[in-house]
């Protein structure tokens, strides 16, 4: 019987995906002593097991549970930085402010950052040609379900003051359909999290508007308040200066508003 394979709308699995995941795991466990016990071959086997031979539109959070178990990691719950549509700056920030963590600073987030992967139903093959697109094909695809799973767990672990970096250059500064808006916001635990503090990052040099008054930020405030979590918001008018001041807080120019 001739086999027919679905042609998906999204890009295929990232080249050298197995080697990349394994190499990243080894690198991460070398750099982070608290994760030295992790067996990277087992991590890869669990990662592979989550999507290989399964229909790439029928992936569940349960499929990733063996991987989640192996990648269990404790990060300081009061040092969590979430982000939406502004990943690069968030990562630059945690590279400088070493005691704060984005999801991609954890093992599982680090392994999968910027990668795409999917398999084929009933074969052990990785699909390097195409993978399902979240909008055009299906939402329960291997990549989307992975990020939904790890994002939920990351948000559930947060406590005290949680920070979120938002992109002030976008039409929707807070987007209910983003991972932050659809997963993380709803999985912050009111009994542990006192405040969500949003940092709205400005794009234009001359942009002096108070983006904390943006309707989508007000919408975020409403959602958070209804969950019995306090909300605060800060404008970051000069992201370059903001980073510089994180690096050198003693700098005289860092006392003024950034």
């Amino acid at each position: 019987v001739p086999r027919w394979r679905q042609q998906w709308s999204g890009p295929g699995t990232t080249k050298r995906f197995p080697e990349t995941v394994l190499a990243r795991c080894v690198k991460y466990t070398e750099i982070h002593p608290e994760m030295r016990h992790v067996d990277c071959q087992s991590v890869w086997d669990a990662f592979k097991g989550a999507f290989i031979s399964k229909h790439p539109c029928n992936i569940t959070e349960e499929d990733y549970q063996p991987l989640m178990k192996l990648g269990t990691q404790t990060v300081p719950c009061n040092k969590i930085l979430l982000w939406s549509r502004i990943k690069d700056l968030a990562h630059q920030f945690t590279q400088v402010q070493r005691d704060m963590f984005t999801l991609e600073d954890t093992l599982l987030g680090y392994l999968a950052d910027d990668l795409t992967w999917c398999g084929e139903f009933n074969t052990s093959k990785i699909n390097y040609q195409s993978c399902p697109d979240w909008r055009k094909d299906c939402s329960n695809n291997p990549v989307s379900v992975f990020w939904k799973t790890v994002s939920r767990r990351f948000a559930e672990a947060a406590c005290d003051v949680v920070h979120v970096m938002l992109n002030g250059s976008r039409s929707k500064i807070f987007d209910k359909n983003s991972t932050f808006g659809s997963v993380e916001v709803h999985n912050l635990q009111p009994e542990k999290v006192q405040t969500l503090e949003a940092w709205v990052i400005h794009g234009g040099r001359e942009d002096s508007r108070d983006l904390c008054q943006d309707p989508t930020i007000k919408e975020l405030e409403s959602i958070i308040s209804k969950r019995n979590i306090q909300f605060s918001c800060k404008n970051i008018y000069r992201p370059d200066k903001f980073l510089q001041c994180v690096k050198n807080p003693e700098d005289s120019s860092c006392t003024s508003e950034i």
Epitope: P2, R3, R5, Q7, G12, K15, R16, F17, P18, E19, E120, T123, S124, K125, I126, N127, Y128, Q129, S130
Partner: antibody, heavy 119, light 111 residues
Framework: QVQLKESGPGLVQPSETLSLTCTVS????????VNWVRQPPGKGLEWMGR???????DYNSALKSRLSISRDTSKGQVFLKMNSLQTEDTAIYFC?????????????WGPGTMVTVLS | QFTLTQPKSVSGSLRSTITIPCERS????????VSWYQQHLGRPPINVIY?????PSEVSDRFSGSIDSSSNSASLTITNLQMDDEADYFC??????????FGGGTKLTVL
């Protein structure tokens, strides 16, 4: 029907650059990838590289520094350039279509063009 | 990168059945699809098997492909051998970089 045909010089001097053209018909270069494969006389097949339907390019790492693949979609042509030719580059050069799926095989081949690097 | 190893030559008598193996040096044979090509002297290769065991519609059903995880090999089987089957046969797969890998080729002689 699907057809591919290679063309180029039969003879090349050592250290010169080889330029080959693969002219295709019966399918669109924006729907299918085209690969270059060569075969030295009496030997096996060696994959050289490909240009994908979206225009991105991959090269065999052993040949990467000497290869350049490009295309003209309006003319249905794919080009191969390889510099610093040596006698061991003497081979039949084929272009082949890579189907638009995850099987990574070649369903149609050109007849090949013989390239001899003079010693 | 792995290699694909084929015997240099295989022979079979008319109307018999032959099998050409193709052994993968590292990684699992089932991880990536295997294809097979037939090449007559002075002609371009023709695909006879793709996706491990799929046969193009124009290829005779005397040709079949399989993979065997215990030997980490793929095999091309030709039944009811004909004189016109005398040719070179190449297996082919790809790695995780989607680099295409060919076996060294097997010369089939029909006795």
């Amino acid at each position: 029907q699907v057809q591919l045909k290679e063309s180029g010089p039969g003879l090349v001097q050592p250290s010169e650059t080889l330029s080959l053209t693969c002219t295709v018909s019966g399918f669109s270069l924006t729907s299918y990838g085209v690969n270059w494969v060569r075969q030295p006389p009496g030997k096996g097949l060696e994959w050289m590289g490909r240009i994908w339907n979206d225009g991105s390019i991959d090269y065999n790492s052993a040949l990467k520094s000497r290869l350049s693949i490009s295309r003209d979609t309006s003319k249905g042509q794919v080009f191969l350039k390889m510099n610093s030719l040596q006698t061991e580059d003497t081979a039949i050069y084929f272009c082949a279509r890579g189907p638009y799926n995850n099987y990574w095989y070649f369903d149609f081949w050109g007849p090949g063009t013989m390239v001899t690097v003079l010693s | 990168q792995f290699t694909l190893t084929q015997p240099k030559s295989v022979s079979g008598s008319l109307r018999s059945t032959i099998t050409i193996p193709c052994e993968r040096s590292s990684g699992d044979i089932g991880d990536n699809y295997v294809s097979w090509y037939q090449q007559h002297l002075g002609r371009p290769p023709i695909n006879v098997i793709y996706a491990d065991d799929q046969r193009p519609s124009e290829v005779s059903d005397r040709f079949s492909g399989s993979i065997d995880s215990s030997s980490n090999s793929a095999s091309l089987t030709i039944t009811n051998l004909q004189m016109d089957d005398e040719a070179d046969y190449f297996c082919q797969s790809y790695d995780s970089n989607i680099d295409i890998i060919f076996g060294g080729g097997t010369k089939l002689t029909v006795l």
